[in-house]
């Protein structure tokens, strides 16, 4: 799982009279904050669904796993989790599902440590450039980020502004190249239309790329090439119609890749000989028994594996002049 | 500039109920948050409540918690405060704001309606 996870079985909980203590100094070895339970022995924090409506100021020290999931937080300013001192074994950050809107740039300094983080099931309308590196410098600090979660932070559609969604998370991952050690990313439901062309070049050391449930209809102007690492790449349940030559010859260039492509709405028309030759041959596709026509209708469920190029024709497009109305 | 108008308030037995209702002009995007606040003579105001138009997040003071609920309409560009079990310290002036931040001061709005009187009787 990608969620920080903690063994602990016993935490204790905040003190009441802690429950208006906002003090500058630092945090009692043991202190909890109000609305959460803690565990040293696990180095773990726990403050869910207690509608926080922001981070706690006394975070103790030792938090190494810190859940803040199901709250009301609304906004994570600069700094929100600087401290002196610095939560410097802050490894693991859940923050799904805490009706978070806007992530200002920064939002993240001060966590050395920090390997996972989780923003899923936020509705992100607003999420700076500089969320991840913290700095508008074109080259920033390495963050020390391998895991990012970005599972359906897509906000309402009406809601987006006429911004270009893809284009701020986008921006975000990419900004002063602070992200080159992740590993992991996972973009899944988000209503995805395009990759930006860019974007996984420079990622160099993706391991895992999550795609799944967007709405992908071509993959024409991205490469893999660069993605020598890469071993999962989920695209399943979007709107790919074919793979073309490019791509596929990428794919398979990979030496350690699985690429899930179940529940897309393939187009069976002379398009998509390559891919079928391919999928015959290809180790690298999970599932690829399963994957089937949808389009033309006179195709539609047929397995990709069993057709062969006789099946596979395109209506002839008939010259201007022998068109009739 | 936007234009909030309130509406809903009046004269209530105490432990009744009242629905105040905040209609902006139109949506205001530069605004995130859209608050109640309230006055009475001679105070501050108050922060009641606020909710964010995009995720909805709420947010309440202490003494409201449980017995007011603050929701929206981002449809009709409308706010509401929900206030049940009411006391006679909750009467007062209430306000409708419109905000950039997160915020529960008085200086973190910009834009203010002119304001609905509730009155509690005990």
């Known amino acids: 799982s990608s969620s920080p996870t903690s063994s602990a079985s016993s935490f204790s909980s905040s003190a009441p009279f802690l429950a208006s203590a906002v003090s500058a100094q630092p945090p009692l070895p043991d202190q909890c904050p109000a609305l959460c339970e803690c565990s040293e022995a696990a180095r773990t924090v726990k403050c869910v669904n207690r509608n926080l409506t922001e981070v706690p100021t006394d975070l103790p020290a030792y938090v190494r796993n810190l859940f803040l999931t199901g709250n009301q937080l609304a906004v994570l300013p600069a700094g929100a989790f600087a401290r002196r001192p610095p939560l410097a074994e802050l490894a693991a950050l859940n923050l799904s599902g805490s009706r978070l809107d806007e992530v200002r740039a920064g939002a993240f300094e001060h966590l050395p440590s920090l390997r996972q983080l989780d923003l899923s099931h936020n509705p992100l309308a607003d999420l700076s450039p500089f969320a991840f590196s913290g700095s508008n410098a074109s080259v920033s600090a390495p963050s020390p980020l391998v895991e990012l979660i970005l599972n359906h932070i897509v906000p309402p559609e009406d809601e987006r502004q006429n911004r270009s969604f893809e284009g701020m998370v986008v921006a975000a991952l990419l900004a002063g190249r602070a992200l080159q050690g992740l590993r992991r990313l996972e973009l899944a439901s988000n209503h995805f239309l395009y990759l930006p062309r860019d974007v996984l070049a420079q990622l160099p050391s993706l391991r895992h790329l999550d795609l799944s449930n967007n709405s992908l209809v071509s993959l024409t102007y991205v490469s893999f090439r660069n993605l020598t690492h890469l071993e999962s790449l989920h695209l399943e349940d979007n709107a790919l119609k074919v793979l073309h030559n490019g791509t596929l010859a990428e794919l398979q260039g990979l030496p350690h890749i699985r690429v899930f492509l179940d529940n897309n709405p393939w187009v069976c028309d002379c398009h998509m000989a390559d891919m079928v030759t391919w999928l015959k041959e290809t180790e690298v596709v999970q599932g690829k028994d399963r994957l089937t026509c949808a389009y033309p209708e006179k195709m539609r469920n047929r397995v990709l594996l069993e057709l062969n190029s006789a099946d596979l024709d395109c209506d002839p497009i008939l010259p201007p002049s022998l068109q009739t109305s | 500039q936007v234009q909030l108008q309130e509406s809903g308030g009046g004269l209530v037995q105490a432990g009744g109920s009242l629905r105040l209702s905040c209609a902006a002009s139109?949506?205001?995007?530069?605004?995130?948050?859209m608050a109640w606040f309230r006055q009475t003579p001679g105070k501050e105001r108050e922060f009641v409540a606020a909710?964010?138009?995009?995720?909805?997040?709420?947010r309440y003071t202490d003494s409201v918690k449980g017995r007011f609920s603050i929701s929206k309409d981002n449809a009709i560009n409308t706010v509401y405060l929900q206030t049940n079990s009411l006391k006679s310290e909750d009467t007062a002036v209430y306000y409708c704001?419109?905000?950039?931040?997160?915020?529960?001061?008085?200086?973190?709005?910009?834009?203010w309606g002119q304001g609905t009187l509730v009155t509690v009787k005990p």
């Open positions: 909710v964010r138009w995009i995720g909805g997040a709420t």
């Open positions: 704001a419109a905000g950039q931040t997160w915020g529960t001061k008085f200086t973190d709005y910009s834009d």
């Open positions: 139109r949506r205001p995007f530069s605004s995130k948050t």
